[in-house]
Interface confidence: low
Amino acid sequence: MMTGTIETTGNISAEKGGSIILQCHLSSTTAQVTQVNWEQQDQLLAICNADLGWHISPSFKDRVAPGPGLGLTLQSLTVNDTGEYFCIYHTYPDGTYTGRIFLEVLESSVAEHGARFQIP
């Protein structure tokens, strides 16, 4: 039975040209985390593997930095970065937990962090 929950940074906004940290936190489970994937729609951005650490997809190497922790930092943001991002925790024996973050990249300086929320 999957008992864990993923807490994410929720709906967030940031300014064009700036950077943002995407964070997910898995709690309420004793499962072993084997790998965390970060994806944007259908594109793989990065992987953090329990044995071998981080791998950033070549097409994102210039704008994606691993961390802090199991999070992901997006840099040099463009309006095209607006959209859904997913953290996918691969665990044993529970299976896969997925958290969703919606990022809006704004032209002006009205960027403001949204509230935190939980996904079961």
Epitope: L26, S27, T29, T30, A31, Q32, V33, C48, N49, A50, D51, L52, G53, W54, P66, G69, L70, T91, Y92
Partner: antibody
């Protein structure tokens, strides 16, 4: 906040055994490997082995296979390392470290002195 | 086992100076290398992982790079809190192995 609190300094006699503890807090203990490292004046830093707190599975450095035993107590979120048949060469500082793809957090170290 | 040959073993430098430490891997480690800093009180902290990725909160004067089997840690402008011991670590294969360390002292 992630914390790894190791047990205090130990003074033990040659031939004896000692059990060092590393209490984890601030994260899901069973979600991440725990590693142990020895630091001595002779050989600098040496990787002893790792344990998966979820199922107790261990991987040892062959140099420490007969010297160290790694265990965990999930209910208290504590990792243990027992060192056997101690000699003066085992005098060192021993560190536990949380692992996820890399050492990302270290305990403060436990000093072990083996002396008659 | 993979041997990590670290140099120099000690280094005396002045505040504001640029310094580089090097570790050479005896076998291919594919970039799976970290740099650790140990303060005089024994506290160990990871500075860099995966050859060149700075840990959260680590000042940007620290950087890591690779040239073949040689891995380097560079401090662009030394500050007083940088005087400490530094170790490289390979985690490409078991057993994980460390360099012998570099003691960075104030001149």
């Amino acid at each position: 906040e992630v914390q790894l609190q190791e047990s205090g300094p130990e003074l033990v006699k040659p031939g004896a055994s000692v059990k060092i503890s590393c209490k984890a807090s601030g994260y899901s203990f069973t979600g991440y490997y725990m590693l142990w490292v020895k630091q001595s004046h002779v050989k600098s830093l040496e990787w002893i082995g790792r344990i998966n707190p979820y199922n107790g599975a261990t991987t040892y450095n062959q140099n420490f296979k007969d010297k160290a035993s790694l265990t965990v107590n999930k209910s208290s979120s504590t990792a243990y390392m027992e060192l056997h048949s101690l000699t003066s060469e085992d005098s060192a500082v021993y560190y536990c470290a949380r692992w996820f793809g890399d050492f990302d957090f270290w305990g403060q170290g436990t000093t072990l002195t083996v002396s008659s | 086992d993979i041997q990590m040959t670290q140099s120099p073993s000690s280094l005396s430098a002045s505040l504001g100076e640029r310094v580089s430490l090097t570790c050479r891997a005896s076998q291919e480690i594919s970039g799976y290398l970290s740099w650790l800093q140990q303060k005089p009180d024994g506290t160990i902290k990871r500075l860099i992982y995966a050859t060149s990725t700075l840990d959260s909160g680590v000042p940007k004067r620290f950087s890591g790079s690779r040239s073949g089997s040689d891995y380097s840690l560079t401090i662009s402008s030394l500050e007083s809190e940088d005087f400490a011991d530094y170790y490289c670590l390979q985690y490409a294969s078991y057993p994980f192995t460390f360099g012998s360390g570099t003691k960075l002292e104030i001149k």
